[in-house]
């Protein structure tokens, strides 16, 4: 189970010292920006217990591995649901702290209720100030019994649950009708998903006989131990004041856990610490009992005393839970409680013992979960003990579980339980990260998502030029950080594979997926210079230019051609793929603009320097718009237009085209050429009698210049529908009221 | 979906005996109060009788105090009242109605059974 | 045993607000915040329209709103529609029984 605690101080005279303090053991726990840690959370849940909002409760991180939650202004703050989630990934895991008001008309009799799957629970709700209404049970938030305010017994109002299954685990509460919420009796009820002493899926596996109040983890087999014990199945106590998976843990305060109440992960769920019991754990256990919550008893035999943190302490020559062992019978010695190897590894297992008379080799052996047992290969006899060694077969993944060394003598026999986790090596899911290249480096981010176990110890980078037989060349990082592959060919490919290894031996797994990361290409070094440019029409640009004659084969791909419209602030650029070409046409541009013009050579992605700047003025678009344009009607079917030339000429007019359109009409407008420019009147024939039509010109250089004003004229009436209008003789494409 | 449905309603004579039932459907029956209501004819509302979940508490209205008896079979998810001694004035429509969780609202009927004592 | 003391009928027009009363004493209306209403139609049985003197169930339109002065409850329906003729009853608790009011028949003129 992941090593975290949830730690509430009851010291309830005054709100304000009130505090939850959040404490992982877990390595790594806590660093929010570490990617292999996610960050401790710790917070007031008000999806099921609502209560009045208040000033925002402060949240302060003390280290990477606790957080405390401060604040509090009233009593009512306390009241509810609070929750700490820690551990990494599928370790993730959230320990829930209930608060209940002490001045409430009903109070728990017990706040945490672990039952096994198909028990039945009862929860007691016990009568501190009395009201003659009707009792709500609720579950989660939601309505879920009645009892009449008659049916207390001995003070006390029992929800009965029997045949209890997973989804029956939330917060109960025991609310008298029309009183506040506040006033309620919170509980929480934890249904492990197997039966008494079982685990695992189908719950076909037995539970190692978790001691001293431990509770046996239903998903894994773990027990998880009450505070102050430690050790696969919680037989070791802590030293006094301490808890943590490993006692590593320290209680506040010179009172030691006095007033603390601790929660665990589930299926544990909360408890006074070891030595310690009542509503506000204030008070020590009673003569002869000991533990969290002081619910062990001792029963000391052969003259051992009670300690009430930590049970029966035995006079020398005696040992064992109630000191019921001689020492004469064999004992096994100081047995890791749990011991990690890595999947296909062959380890060697030691187990030592001692008694009278002497355990040797043969009396010592050791057994798989599979009940497969081992006899040891050698054994080290000292004085005290004997020492023997197992050489283990290529361990599989079916070998994770509880192993055990057994002693046998004519005085009697040991043993002892140990948890063996059979970790496999992490394999990467994905190739590296090409963040940057350059001609001769990479730079590649080597974190990326494993299947198999962490933590991740070392990250090993392989890599090679694509389509080569020569070895690997390994570089060893660190796994946060990012790596620089250098002295790397220029553009050339390479592949590269990432290999991630795990603590231990054999902790190496196999190489991830590979990927092609290509460097770029040498940079272009020679400067270009510009040799000329001439204008091809309004929008038209030939530029040319010229390269430093250099030995050797020229480094480049092609010329990229920049404009810089300052006006507009606008910036155009042209590609020239041929690394020989020295002239380029740049069409497109904007007439009477003034461009600052540049060239450089460019090679792959990367460019040379650019040539001394240039400035060039495009001439303006277009001639000026005719002058004085005037309409007038000749007939039923003509009209005459007449106009004077445009002033302030940039060269001569190669023609005039005059738009016709009928007045009000949907249709196109229609475009007739006037070929001759030296003329400055015209006649448009072909007009359909009694319409009004509108007219606009424009002259043309080398490309069009602006309309002239727009005209409006009739033609006369009484005329037959014409075939479209023409101008002079040339018959129109299509007439303007089709 | 939730749903009451009565049953059990008839002809009587003035002194005789009936048992009605409720059968619940669509919530969990054993975790609810349940009622009895009347409703004699161009008349209103009258509370007859109420029991808790465990069936181990019940009430009643002056009028059929001694007379009636509310129950309740959980298994079966049906509520009764069995009515002795029954009057002219017991004539009504006999209505089940659950209790609405936290309040003391009747948020689920059912359509109601016809009673009619006469001789 | 007593009952809760409504108005025989209470009329208005479509659209218009009326309020129904309900009178009882320190020990059922005044004494109880679970005071409901409840709307028939008839031929029908009763439903429920306003539970803890003030709240709706949903489904239920908020043109019915509750409210307790003393010992007196009131159900207002705003915006009056032909749907709302029906008989109309209050309830409420005391400690061990439940009352229910004479009953208010509205009619939409």
């Known amino acids: 189970a992941v090593d975290l605690t949830l730690l509430a101080n009851l010291r309830l005279t005054d709100p304000q010292r009130f505090f939850l303090t959040c404490v992982s053991g877990e390595a790594g726990a806590g660093r929010g920006s570490d990617a292999w840690g996610p960050p401790l959370l710790l917070e007031k849940d008000d999806r099921i217990v609502r209560t009045p909002p208040g000033p925002p409760l402060r949240l302060a991180r003390n280290g990477s591995h606790q957080v405390t939650l401060r604040g509090f202004s009233k009593p009512s703050d306390l009241v509810g649901v609070f929750s700490c989630v820690g551990g990494a990934g599928a370790r993730r895991t959230r320990v829930i702290y209930v608060h209940n008001s002490p001045g409430a008309h009903l109070l728990p009799d017990k706040v945490t209720h672990t039952v096994n799957k198909g028990d039945t629970a009862v929860l007691s709700a016990r009568v501190h100030k009395e009201k003659q209404t009707d009792v709500i049970w609720k579950s989660n938030g939601s309505y879920f019994y009645t009892l009449d305010w008659h049916e207390a017994q001995d003070g006390r109002f029992l929800l009965q649950l029997p045949n209890v299954q997973p989804p029956s685990s939330g917060i109960y509460s025991a609310t008298y009708l029309e009183a506040s919420p506040l006033g309620s009796a919170f509980f929480r009820l934890i249904v492990r998903g197997c039966g008494a002493g079982r685990w695992g899926p189908g719950c076909t596996k037995e539970c190692p006989g978790c001691l001293h109040g431990g509770v046996c983890h239903d998903h894994d087999g773990e027990c998880v131990c009450p505070p102050g014990f430690t050790g696969t199945r919680c037989e070791q106590a802590c030293r006094e004041g301490r808890f943590g998976q490993s006692c590593q843990e320290q209680c506040p305060g010179i009172s030691g856990c006095r007033g603390l109440t601790f929660c665990l992960p589930d299926p544990y769920g909360c408890s006074c610490g070891s030595g310690w019991r009542g509503s506000q754990c204030q008070e020590a256990c009673a003569p002869g009992h000991f533990g969290a919550d002081c619910r062990l008893q001792c029963q000391c035999q052969n003259g051992g005393t009670c300690d009430r943190f930590s049970g029966c302490v035995c006079p020398s020559g005696w040992h064992g839970v109630h000191c019921e062992k001689s020492d004469r019978i064999p004992q096994i010695l100081n047995m890791a409680s749990e011991l990690e190897f890595n999947l296909e590894t062959m380890p060697r297992i030691n187990c030592a013992a001692a008694g009278n008379p002497f355990p040797v080799r043969g009396s010592i052996e050791l057994r798989k979960p599979d009940g497969t047992v081992l006899l040891s290969t050698k054994a080290i006899v000292e004085p005290e003990k004997t020492t023997a060694e197992f050489e283990v077969p290529r361990l599989v993944l079916a070998d994770s579980g509880f192993w055990e060394c057994r002693v046998s003598t004519s005085g009697g026999q040991d043993s002892r339980r140990f948890k063996v986790n059979v970790k496999v090596p992490p394999v990467p899911l994905a190739a590296p990260r090409l963040l940057t290249k350059q001609s001769r480096q990479l730079v590649v981010s080597p974190l990326v998502s494993f299947s198999g176990d962490g933590p991740i110890s070392t990250v090993r980078l392989h890599y090679r030029p694509q389509d080569s037989t020569m070895d690997w060349s390994t570089i060893v990082v660190d796994p946060s950080e990012n790596v620089t592959l250098m002295n790397l060919r220029p553009k050339t490919g390479y592949s590269v594979r990432v290999q991630l290894s795990r603590p231990g031996e054999g902790g190496e797994g196999a190489w991830g997926p590979p990927t092609l990361m290509t460097t770029d290409c040498p940079e272009p070094l020679l400067q270009p210079w510009l040799e000329g440019w001439h204008v091809e029409g309004t929008d038209r640009l030939r530029v040319s230019w010229s390269l430093p004659l250099v030995p050797g084969p020229l480094v480049g791909d092609g010329f990229l051609l920049r404009l810089w419209d300052g006006t507009r602030g606008q910036e155009r650029r042209e590609n020239v793929s041929s690394p020989q070409a020295r002239t380029a046409l740049l069409t497109g541009l904007t007439p009477g603009t003034h461009y600052q013009l540049d060239v450089q050579l460019y090679h792959c992605t990367l460019l040379g320097p650019a040539s001394p700047p240039a400035h060039v003025l495009l001439p303006p678009s277009g001639p000026p718009a005719p002058r004085h344009l005037h309409a007038q009607a000749l007939s039923d079917s003509e009209i005459q237009l007449t106009w004077k030339h445009p002033e302030a000429l940039p060269g001569p007019i190669s023609k005039y085209v005059v738009e016709v359109q009928v007045a009000g009409g949907a249709g196109d407008p229609l475009w007739i050429d006037v070929d001759r420019p030296e003329e400055t009147s015209t006649i448009i024939r072909g007009l359909n009698a009694s319409t009004r039509y509108l007219f606009r010109m424009r002259a043309s250089i080398q490309g069009l210049g602006d309309w002239s004003n727009t005209v409006e004229e009739s033609t006369l009436g009484n005329g037959l529908q014409a075939e479209g209008p023409v101008q002079e003789s040339r018959a129109a494409e299509e007439g303007l009221d089709q | 979906e939730v749903q009451l449905l009565e049953s059990g309603g008839g002809l009587v004579q003035p002194g005789g005996s009936l048992r009605l039932s409720c059968a619940a459907s669509?919530?969990?029956?054993?975790?609810?109060?349940m009622h009895w209501v009347r409703q004699a004819p161009g008349k209103g509302l009258e509370w007859v009788s109420r029991i808790y979940p465990s069936g181990g508490w019940t009430y009643y209205a002056d009028s059929v105090k001694g007379r009636f008896t509310i129950s309740r079979d959980n298994s079966k998810n049906t509520l009764y009242l069995q009515m002795n001694s029954l009057r002219a004035e017991d004539t009504a429509v006999y209505y089940c109605?659950?209790?609405?969780?936290?309040?003391?609202?009747?948020?689920?009927w059912g359509q109601g059974t016809t009673v009619t004592v006469s001789s | 045993q007593y009952e809760l003391t409504q108005p025989a009928s209470v009329s208005g027009s479509p659209g218009q607000s009326i309020t129904i009363s309900c009178t009882g004493t320190s020990s059922d209306v005044g004494g109880c915040n679970y005071v409901s209403w409840y709307q028939q139609h008839p031929g029908k049985a009763p439903q429920l329209l306003i539970y803890?003197?003030?709240y709706r169930p949903s489904g239920v339109s908020n043109r019915f709103s509750g409210s307790k002065s003393g010992n007196t409850a009131s159900l207002t329906i705003s915006g009056l529609q032909a749907d709302d003729e029906a008989d109309y009853y209050c309830?409420?608790?005391?400690?061990?029984?439940?009352?229910f009011g004479t009953g208010t028949k509205v009619t939409v003129l």
């Open positions: 803890d003197v003030s």
């Open positions: 109605a659950r209790v609405a969780g936290e309040s003391n609202g009747m948020d689920v």
């Open positions: 309830s409420s608790c005391t400690s061990s029984s439940t009352l």
């Open positions: 669509g919530f969990t029956f054993s975790r609810y109060v």
